[in-house]
Interface confidence: medium
């Protein structure tokens, strides 16, 4: 069971300081941006991180949404990352959900975050280069100290 607490507005960056944004095709991508670029591209660079109470002690449960014309929420259904047109629900009556991630702080690095899927234990949000694009994907953690699954989260409100 997950019960919604409150939400905050955040900018999410990978460890190469590229900014996460949602493009015109609703794809989550990373791109080099100056602070003014980041502001100019809002609301596509501003993510709504909603925190949830978890009935099991597993960590800080969150959803990640973005509001352009409508609110879309990040999903990892079938281990494929996409934004689905939906509001983060007030309650989820299950112990796992494709839209719930556990936001974890890397031991020894309080400012570095990981987002582990509640549906797929051991799978994390990651940045992966595909041709010329830096995409947000779901990835099984397979190597120690994998920087691709680490992010910084900067609160905007």
């Amino acid at each position: 069971y997950f019960g919604k607490l409150e939400s905050k507005l955040s900018v999410i960056r990978n460890l190469n300081d590229q900014v996460l944004f949602i493009d015109q095709g609703n794809r989550p991508l990373f791109e080099d941006m100056t602070d003014s670029d980041c502001r100019d591209n809002a609301p596509r660079t501003i993510f709504i991180i909603s925190m949830y109470k978890d009935s099991q002690p597993r960590g800080m449960a969150v959803t990640i949404s973005v509001k352009c014309e409508k609110i879309s929420t990040l999903s990892c259904e079938n281990k494929i990352i996409s934004f689905k047109e939906m509001n983060p629900p007030d309650n989820i009556k299950d112990t796992k959900s494709d839209i719930i991630f556990f936001q974890r702080s890397v031991p020894g690095h309080d400012n570095k975050m990981q987002f582990e899927s509640s549906s797929y234990e051991g799978y994390f949000l990651a940045c992966e280069k595909e041709r010329d694009l830096f995409k947000l994907i779901l990835k099984k953690e397979d190597e120690l100290g994998d920087r691709s699954i680490m992010f910084t989260v900067q609160n905007e409100d």
């Epitope: 597993r58 974890r104 031991p107």
Partner: antibody, heavy 119, light 110 residues
Framework: EVQLVQSGAEVKKPGSSVKVSCKAS????????ISWVRQAPGQGLEWMGN????????YYAQKFQGRVTITADESTSTAYMELSSLRSEDTAVYYC????????????WGQGTLVTVSS | DIVLTQPPSVSGAPGQRVTISCSGS????????VNWYQQLPGTAPKLLIY???HRPSGVPDRFSGSKSGTSASLAITGLQSEDEADYYC???????????FGGGTKLTVL
């Protein structure tokens, strides 16, 4: 770097209660779990329960259910552990431990508080 | 009460490699991650390994963890006198809905 500072040593009579505090400084407090772990003299570690201050409710190990109460005050970044109906076998060092990665990965520990239960 | 089994003591000479075992069951290690803590004499425990084999920053790469089935082990290479301490394994236990520690292993550097 987060620091957890615990209250001082206590001597208590059997049947009484003790309340130990744990103040966090230098880092995020509210969204991470604070656990309480005890260690009897010359013995191993024993988890008692935890709280995620932001959630406001605690989880307790079965063994301590009904006898331990874990609370947190977000405004002062302080967690508390109260143990009631004390007996001599509760004599131990009580540690608070922060868990930022996972509620059960204790990456930061307080210095410990010795609680002695003696008549 | 102790659900995870560790040898009470191990020893090794400086520069040697030692391993500490931790044996559990399908309700804990078999289906969950293992963490290791080091407790130097008179001090609070310190996280050494988390999620089976991850080292927090600041922990030397002489320390490594592994897991297979319902057992886990901690390996320390290039043993140093400052490694003399108690070592505890820890895992989540679904049957007791609790986290469990091993009984601890005292490492002596000869």
């Amino acid at each position: 770097e987060v620091q957890l500072v615990q209250s001082g040593a206590e001597v208590k009579k059997p049947g009484s209660s003790v309340k130990v505090s744990c103040k966090a400084s230098g880092g995020t407090f509210n969204s991470y779990a604070i656990s309480w772990v005890r260690q009897a003299p010359g013995q191993g570690l024993e988890w008692m329960g935890n709280i995620i201050p932001h959630y406001g409710f605690a989880y307790y190990a079965q063994k301590f259910q009904g006898r331990v109460t874990i609370t947190a005050d977000e405004s002062t970044s302080t967690a508390y552990m109260e143990l009631s109906s004390l007996r001599s076998e509760d004599t131990a060092v009580y540690y608070c431990a922060r868990a930022a990665y996972h509620p059960l990965v204790f990456d930061n520990w307080g210095q410990g508080t010795l609680v002695t239960v003696s008549s | 009460d102790i659900v995870l089994t560790q040898p009470p003591s191990v020893s090794g000479a400086p520069g040697q490699r030692v391993t500490i075992s931790c044996s559990g069951s399908s309700s804990n290690i078999g289906n969950h991650y293992v963490n290791w803590y080091q407790q130097l004499p008179g001090t609070a425990p310190k996280l050494l390994i988390y999620r089976n084999n991850h080292r927090p920053s600041g922990v030397p790469d002489r320390f490594s963890g592994s897991k297979s089935g319902t057992s886990a082990s901690l390996a320390i290479t290039g043993l140093q006198s400052e490694d003399e301490a108690d070592y505890y394994c820890q895992s989540w236990d679904y049957s007791g809905f609790s986290t469990v520690f091993g009984g601890g292993t005292k490492l002596t550097v000869l």
